[in-house]
Interface confidence: low
């Protein structure tokens, strides 16, 4: 029977800069029941606070709701593991909410083959930002990436769309069924998961771009 091993805070993420969650990995339990607590203070403050919500984020997590989340303050946090034989502490982690945003995937992905009479045909893709991202506040510059591939192909073709919420692709294989997905990231954060795939059948008379 031993004191617990050193825990590690391994990830913090925010869907929208209004709330965030941090997760830790327990160390060894020393063969005894072990309690974990996360404490934090804001940079420039000495007052320590305990995690406000151990439930929302699931096991070994701390969730910071709106009232505990400040955009321009750095949080300094650590996890304490305690059993009957003693305690151990994680390293301190410095968290700035601005840099841990991982949005939900974009919404309403729509894909259409356009075949104008006077120009090359193309694939037109459009989508909406995730609704949790409040673009009216100016907090976010969202960047988008599209991937697509023929249904049976192994490799994805990647296109960076910048801040646009629509995109045109000219070079496609006629007669193929394509999968299309889109994801987004804020300028300083993490890529979202890919949106659910949308399928589109490219007509056999689709002319490849020269």
């Amino acid at each position: 029977q031993l004191p617990p091993g050193k825990p590690e805070i391994f990830k913090c993420r925010s869907p929208n800069k209004e709330t965030f969650t941090c997760w830790w990995r327990p160390g060894t339990d020393g063969g005894l029941p072990t309690n974990y607590s996360l404490t934090y203070h804001r940079e420039g403050e000495t007052l320590m606070h305990e995690c406000p919500d151990y439930i929302t984020g699931g096991p070994n997590s701390c969730h910071f709701g709106k009232q505990y989340t400040s955009m321009w303050r750095t949080y300094i946090m650590m996890v304490n593991a305690t059993n009957q034989m003693g305690s151990s502490f994680s390293d301190e982690l410095y968290v700035d909410v601005t840099y841990i945003v991982q949005p939900d995937p974009p919404l309403e992905l729509a894909v259409e083959v356009k075949q104008p009479e006077d120009r090359k045909p193309y694939l037109w893709i459009k989508w909406s930002p995730p609704t949790l991202i409040d673009l009216k506040t100016g907090w976010f510059t969202l960047l988008y990436e599209i991937r697509l591939k023929p249904e049976k192909a192994a490799e994805w073709e990647i296109h960076f769309a910048g801040q646009q919420t629509e995109f045109k692709i000219l070079s496609l294989h006629p007669g193929q069924k394509y999968l299309v997905q889109v994801r987004c990231k804020p300028d300083h954060g993490y890529w979202s998961a890919w949106s659910p795939a949308t399928f589109i059948q490219i007509p056999s008379d689709f002319t490849m771009n020269d």
Epitope: N16, E18, K66, Q67, S70, P129, D134, L135, T137, G138
Partner: antibody, heavy 116, light 107 residues
């Protein structure tokens, strides 16, 4: 319940100044951008500008840039609009508003009249 | 600046009618659009954000749709308390801009 209460409106001379205040309650003021919107008598709504949570960034409509200044005091849950070089066309009701994720909340407004 | 236009500028309708108001943006604004209701002497009230998402507490007879440049607000069965002026607003780029409003009054 979200509440926003504006004050400081009144009569000002052309070229004069006024300072509007807005006191917020019912939400974490320091977490949100805040906006000012105005409405001339019998007319539609015009966005004036907004300010970031920590006061480090402001945006303005061209017609007020250089004359109006938006500021805030998070310790007092207060938003301000300093209006200088006032013109007749600045007359109207001035609303402060929060830009919350799920829509906006507005105060009841304060009337500014610019007239000689 | 992005210009917002609304049509009609006013309309007369009866209780129980279905009413549709159109808002058009001068350039693509994706779904960065709000709808507001304003009654005389009162502050505007947020009805819909992100073009189609109903604000909490707003009756389900209100609905919004559209993407890009063309948007609509529909009131499926007009109630006495719905007689008011309705504004759209884009928040895609600064400065945020409102439509000129549509006044809905009693026929």
């Amino acid at each position: 319940e979200v509440q926003l209460v504006e004050s400081g409106g009144g009569l000002a001379q052309p070229g004069g100044s006024l300072r509007l205040s807005c006191v917020a309650s019912g939400f974490t003021f320091s977490t949100y951008w805040m906006s000012w919107v105005r409405q001339a008598p019998g007319k539609g709504l015009d966005w004036v500008g907004n300010i970031k949570q920590d006061g480090s960034e402001q945006n303005y409509v061209d017609s007020v840039r250089g004359r109006f200044t938006i500021s805030r005091d998070n310790a007092k849950n207060s938003l301000f609009l300093q209006m200088n070089s006032l013109r007749a066309e600045d007359t109207g009701v001035y609303y402060c508003a929060t830009l919350l994720t799920k829509g906006d909340y507005w105060g009841q407004g304060t009337l500014v009249t610019v007239s000689s | 600046d992005i210009q917002m236009t609304q049509s009609p500028s006013s309309l007369s309708a009866s209780v129980g009618d279905s009413v549709t108001i159109t808002c058009r943006a001068s350039q693509d604004i994706s779904n960065y659009l709000d709808w507001f209701q304003q009654k005389p002497g009162k502050a505007p009230k947020s009805l819909i954000y992100a073009a189609s998402i109903l604000q909490g507490g707003v009756p389900s007879r209100f609905s919004g749709s559209g993407y890009g440049t063309d948007f609509t607000l529909t009131i499926s069965s007009l109630q006495p308390e719905d007689f008011a002026t309705y504004y759209c607003r884009q928040y895609k780029t600064y400065p945020f801009t409102f439509g000129p409003g549509t006044k809905v009054d009693i026929k």
